[in-house]
């Protein structure tokens, strides 16, 4: 049975050109995490490996950064990186878990932090 | 299995820096989170920072972000912390500590420590 | 930056008795919770990450529990290795903060 929940930053915006760091926490479980995927819509990000550690798509090496802890830093932002943004858990035993985030990239300098929720 | 070794006592002149070394050995160096922590008797502990030698990427404590530099030369597999303008309240023993993969800032293998100690 | 408050700050005990610490954080930091063991002059040892998941190594004596903002660490049986002193610190996000630490000695 999967008891576990994903907390995440939630939806949040930031400005063009700036920075963000996406965040998801897996808690209530105590299953073992082997691996994190950091997903935007059906594209791969950047992976978190038990035994081999952080691997960034080459595609995004330039604007991606690993951290801190299991989040990912989005650097040099654009208009096209608004979007839905998902980390998904590989446990053992319970299975997979995928947390949510939508962020908005604005081009104003209005752009403020959501609230973070829970998806479980 | 894993060590982390590292460089010796430092006295030290205040207003000046000083640059301490961190050999780990028992694991591939790259694929690791480091952090360094100090502690200063009745201080507790503190987190400095941290760096992911697979990339060079880092994440200071606002505290300490400015004076302190994280470096990792991955072709003799070391780490160092460069910690610049000490004063007597920088005296302290410094420690590197490997973060566990996929639990981030839990620790669990640490450097002997290093003893810093700033005096005219 | 999430506080920790560790309580107590001594604890004396004698081998073979049944201790608890106890940390309290700030904010909610989910589970993400772990425990230092430190000898004196030597480098703070790995116990619990996870508020309950044992590092590799650690005695079953050991165990470590809690959610929210409350955590306890229990320690039965007390063996003479164990004395020393004891950190909590969440590792939710940064900064990771330590708690004040607790003084095990013997009664």
């Known amino acids: 049975m999967m008891t576990g929940t994903i907390e995440t930053t939630g939806n949040i915006s930031a400005e063009k050109g700036g920075s963000i760091i996406l965040q998801c926490h897996l808690s209530s479980t105590t299953a073992q995490v082997t691996q994190v995927n950091w997903e935007q819509q059906d594209q791969l990000l950047a992976i978190c490996n038990a035994d081999l550690g952080w691997h960034i798509s080459p595609s995004f090496k330039d604007r991606v950064a690993p951290g801190p802890g299991l989040g990912l830093t989005l650097q040099s932002l654009t208009v096209n990186d608004t979007g839905e943004y998902f980390c998904i858990y590989h446990t053992y035993p319970d299975g997979t878990y995928t947390g949510r985030i939508f962020l908005e990239v604005l081009e104003s300098s209005v752009a403020e932090h959501g609230a973070r929720f829970q998806i479980p | 299995q894993v060590q982390l070794q590292q460089s010796g006592a430092e006295l030290v002149r205040p207003g000046t820096s000083v640059k301490i070394s961190c050999k780990p050995s028992?694991?591939?160096?790259?694929?690791?989170?480091l952090g360094w922590v100090k502690q200063r008797p009745g201080h507790g502990l503190e987190w400095i920072g941290d760096?992911?030698?697979?990339?060079?990427?880092?994440n200071y404590n606002e505290k300490f972000k400015g004076r302190a530099t994280l470096t990792a030369d991955t072709s003799s597999s070391t780490a160092y912390m460069q910690l610049s303008s000490l004063t007597s309240e920088d005296s302290a023993v410094y420690f590197c500590a490997r973060s566990r993969q996929l639990a981030s800032y839990a620790m669990d293998y640490w450097g002997q420590g290093t003893s810093v100690t700033a005096s005219s | 930056d999430i506080q920790m408050t560790q309580s107590p700050a001594s604890l004396s005990a004698s081998v073979g008795e049944t201790v608890t610490i106890t940390c309290r954080s700030s904010e909610n930091i989910y589970s993400y919770l772990a425990w230092y063991q430190q000898k004196q002059g030597k480098s703070p040892q790995l116990l619990v990450y996870n508020a309950k998941i044992l590092a590799e190594g650690v005695p079953s004596r050991f165990s470590g529990s809690g959610s929210g903002t409350q955590y306890s660490l229990k320690i039965n049986s007390l063996q003479p290795e164990d004395f020393g002193s004891y950190y909590c610190?969440?590792?939710?996000?940064?900064?990771?903060?330590f708690g004040g630490g607790t003084n095990l000695e013997i009664k």
């Open positions: 610190q969440h590792h939710y996000g940064t900064p990771p903060t």
């Open positions: 760096i992911y030698p697979g990339g060079g990427y880092t």
């Open positions: 028992g694991y591939i160096f790259t694929n690791y989170w």
